[in-house]
Amino acid sequence: MKVLQEPTCVSDYMSISTCEWKMNGPTNCSTELRLLYQLVFLLSEAHTCIPENNGGAGCVCHLLMDDVVSADNYTLDLWAGQQLLWKGSFKPSEHVKPRAPGNLTVHTNVSDTLLLTWSNPYPPDNYLYNHLTYAVNIWSENDPADFRIYNVTYLEPSLRIAASTLKSGISYRARVRAWAQCYNTTWSEWSPSTKWHNSYREPFEQH
C-alpha cells in the first residue's frame, strides 16, 4: 500500500481542516488508514482522524481544530496499521479556504432596486470576519449567456443593483462566495443559490 498523491490540506480558519490524498489502488480509507495530527506546541497531544473514501483510491479527512491562530503548525502522519506511509506538516494560515456565505436573500420590494444580502460565515471574534470580500454570481435560467459576476470589495455582506440591469419578466438565480486577501486564500465554495422573478416597471418612452 502506497500513497500516490500526497495529502494536501485546507483550513476554514475556524474549526475544520480538510485533507485529501490518493492511494495507489482501491482502498477502504476508514478501515485501513488513520491520519494523526498534532499541533507543534509544548505538551500537545496527537489526535486521530478517520478518513472517508473520496472515489475509489481517494481519501478525505476532516481534522477538528480548536480554533486557528497564525502561528499554528501541525505535524501529519498517515498510518496503515503499524506502517507509516507518509509524514508531513501543515500550517493552516497558509492554506485557507473560507467557509461559504449563507442565507442569501434577494429583496425585490425596494423601488426598482434589487438588494441581495447574505450572512458572513464567521463569528465576530474570528480574524476573517472583518477581512472577507465577496463575489456575487447572477444568471438567467432562460439564457445561459446572461451570466454576470459582481465583486463586492467592501465588508458589508450586501449588494444593490438596479433591477433594470437585468431583463424583466424572467427568472434569475444568484449565489455568493468569499475570499480573504490578507491570507491570500482560495475562494470559498458557492453558497446555495436563490431564485427570484425579475420584474420592474419599464420607464415610459418620451416622444
Epitope: 506546541f41 505538551l43 491562530v69
Partner: antibody, heavy 120, light 108 residues
C-alpha cells in the same frame, strides 16, 4: 466555579524535599495540560514544569531539571510537584496553572499559590 | 532558549491616558504563541491576551495586543484606576515557555 487549590508548601532546609499538590475543581483535569510557575519574593514569574493531559509527556525548566518531578492523578483531579535537593533559590510562591489549548499556551486558570521557603 | 525583554521597566501614567508596553524576543518568535498577563499585589496573574492579539474571556476591549517576529506590544487604550499593576509577556513555543521580567504600570 473553575478553581485550582495548591497545598504542601512550607519551610524546608537546603537539600531537603517537599511535595506540592494542586486540587482542581469545576473542570476535568484530564482534558488539560497542567503547569507549575513560581515567583520568588519581589521578582517576576518563572516557568517551572508542565505535563501533558494524559501524563505521557513532561517538560522542565533547566533550573529544576533532575531535581523536580511533575505528575498527575487524573481520576483524583490532582496535580503534583515533587521537589528534592532544594536550594535557597527555589524559595518562591508556586502556582498551579491550567493551559487551555484554545488559548495556545495562555494560562487561563491560576491557583492562589503555595509558599515554599528554603532556609537553614 | 528565547529571552523576552520588556520595556520600560516602569511606566508612570495617569488614568485616561494610553499605555504602550513592549516585549522583545531575542530571536524570531513567529512559530510560538505570545500571551500577556496582569498581576496585582498579593494576587495570582490574570491572562489578558493570547495568540499575540486575542483577548481572553471577560477582558475589556481597551486591552489589545499586536506584533510579530520579535516585537510585540500590549496597548491599554484608556487607563482605568484598576489597570495599574505589573504586566508580563510570555512565550509558549514547541519546546519551551518563557516570561518577560515584567513592566510595572504605576499612577503618575
Amino acid at each position: 466555579e473553575v478553581q485550582l487549590l495548591e497545598s504542601g508548601g512550607g519551610l524546608v532546609q537546603p537539600g531537603g524535599s517537599l511535595r506540592l499538590s494542586c486540587a482542581a475543581s469545576g473542570f476535568t483535569l484530564s482534558s488539560y495540560a497542567m503547569h507549575w510557575v513560581r515567583q520568588a519574593p519581589g521578582k517576576g514569574l518563572e516557568y517551572v514544569s508542565g505535563i501533558s493531559s494524559n501524563g505521557g509527556s513532561t517538560y522542565y525548566a533547566n533550573s529544576v531539571k533532575g531535581r523536580f518531578t511533575i505528575s498527575r492523578d487524573n481520576p483524583k483531579n490532582t496535580l503534583f510537584l515533587q521537589m528534592s535537593s532544594l536550594r535557597a533559590e527555589d524559595t518562591a510562591v508556586y502556582y498551579c496553572v491550567r493551559v487551555f489549548v484554545r488559548y495556545r499556551g495562555g494560562m487561563d486558570v491560576w491557583g492562589q499559590g503555595t509558599t515554599v521557603t528554603v532556609s537553614s | 532558549e528565547i529571552v523576552l525583554t520588556q520595556s520600560p521597566g516602569t511606566l508612570s501614567l495617569s488614568p485616561g491616558e494610553r499605555a504602550t508596553l513592549s516585549c522583545r524576543a531575542s530571536q524570531d518568535a513567529s512559530n510560538a504563541y505570545l500571551a500577556w498577563y496582569q498581576q496585582k499585589p498579593g494576587q495570582a496573574p490574570r491572562l489578558l491576551i493570547y495568540g499575540t492579539s486575542r483577548r481572553a474571556t471577560g477582558i475589556p476591549d481597551r486591552f489589545s495586543g499586536s506584533g510579530s517576529g520579535t516585537d510585540f506590544t500590549l496597548t491599554i487604550s484608556r487607563l482605568e484606576p484598576e489597570d495599574f499593576a505589573v504586566y508580563y509577556c510570555q512565550l509558549y513555543g514547541s519546546s519551551s515557555v518563557t516570561f518577560g521580567q515584567g513592566t510595572k504600570l504605576e499612577i503618575k
